[in-house]
Amino acid sequence: AFGISGVQKYTRALHDSSITGISPITEYLASLSTYNDQSITFALEDESYEIYVEDLKKDEKKDKVLLSYYESQHPSNESGDGVDGKMLMVTLSPTKDFWLHANNKEHSVELHKCEKPLPDQAFFVLHNMHSNCVSFECKTDPGVFIGVKDNHLALIKVDSSENLCTENILFKLSET
């Protein structure tokens, strides 16, 4: 399981952290799947995009997401790291002008059309593991991650004080 303990202690002030550059330091086009190998897909319905978590049929093409990586500085009084207190934040865009957004009131993940500069709700702190396993923590709500709930993406609170099985917040990135 993916260890998240200690996350909240150092991310309480995420909303105060600053993106150090307007341009991403790198971008990466990848398909997104759950830890259990279900695909994250995006469908245009009634002029808005819906997000699905589903098993794809054999040879069915996976949807791609553009991950844009930004550097963000910890608030210096919070981290004690000085110039070295960097985090990676990502935005996720499955199609032009649309980005994943955290809706903290509804505990949901939505696709919104918007212009740059993107709102804070579109930024997620990247927690990454070996072999392209990642999780996405809301910039606007520390300790809350994109996760899978009832075959949909949702926002899930990770309580670092408990030894939770957190596979539902783990995602795999792949080029295929």
Partner: antibody, heavy 121, light 106 residues
Framework: EVQLVETGGGLVQPGRSLKLSCVAS????????MYWIRQAPGMGLEWVSS????????YYLDSVKGRFTISRNNAENTVYLQMNSLRSEDTATYYC??????????????WGQGTLVTVSS | DIQMTQSPSVLSASVGDRVTLSCKAS??????LDWCQQKVGEAPKLLIY???NLQTGIPSRFSGSGSGTDYTLTISSLQPEDVATYFC????????FGGGTKLELK
């Protein structure tokens, strides 16, 4: 200022054990992945082992799996490498390094000065 | 496992030269590549991360480029203090170093 200080190296006979320590300062240790990288005399760099920020996930070079164990004590800002069943090919300078970003296994931003391990009879 | 191949293994150049070092990955590494510098008797030092981002405190004569499997470190005007061995390093899948390029003065 970020500092990483490795200790515990020395001369050891094949088959014996050694434990390396790396004490970190100048950054919030519990936020960062930590690594051990080695360099045999006159050779290139070789990644050996990694541990994530809370110690729950560890990774090893195939040739050291089952013999080496990486661990960390976040309260003491220290990462360890327990090396058992040492072989002559483990002879190298062992460097401790920290991750470049909080919570991320991407990149190594700082390295210690290294500690030399010599395995010889 | 991803293999990283650096070329040339040794490079001789003169002060002021524009120097290019190459690193090739066995698979696409999506720009997840760093360059570090190691001087004799010293620990390695990070120069470039994520292919083209200059680490804090590193002179601007160093730059990186590339994508997919092919990556380059360029020193725009070689200085005597740049004599060192340069390693590329990927972290797209696991962690792997290239064999290094030793840069010497002519």
């Amino acid at each position: 200022e970020v500092q990483l200080v490795e200790t515990g190296g020395g001369l050891v006979q094949p088959g014996r054990s050694l434990k390396l320590s790396c004490v970190a300062s100048g950054f919030t240790f519990s936020n960062y992945w930590m690594y051990w990288i080695r360099q045999a005399p006159g050779m290139g760099l070789e990644w050996v082992s990694s541990i994530n920020n809370d110690g729950g996930n560890t990774y090893y070079l195939d040739s050291v799996k089952g013999r080496f164990t990486i661990s960390r004590n976040n309260a003491e800002n220290t990462v360890y490498l327990q090396m058992n069943s040492l072989r002559s090919e483990d002879t190298a300078t062992y460097y401790c390094a920290k991750g470049h970003y909080s919570y991320s296994s991407y990149s190594f931003s700082y390295w210690g000065q290294g500690t030399l391990v010599t395995v010889s009879s | 496992d991803i293999q990283m191949t650096q070329s040339p293994s040794v490079l001789s150049a003169s002060v002021g030269d524009r120097v290019t070092l190459s690193c090739k990955a066995s698979h696409n590494i999506n720009k997840h590549l760093d360059w570090c510098q190691q001087k004799v008797g010293e620990a390695p030092k990070l120069l470039i991360y994520f292919t083209n981002n200059l680490q804090t405190g590193i002179p601007s004569r160093f730059s990186g480029s590339g994508s997919g499997t092919d990556y380059t470190l360029t020193i725009s005007s070689l200085q005597p203090e740049d004599v060192a061995t340069y390693f590329c390093f990927q972290y797209n899948s696991g962690w792997t170093f290239g064999g290094g390029t030793k840069l010497e003065l002519k």
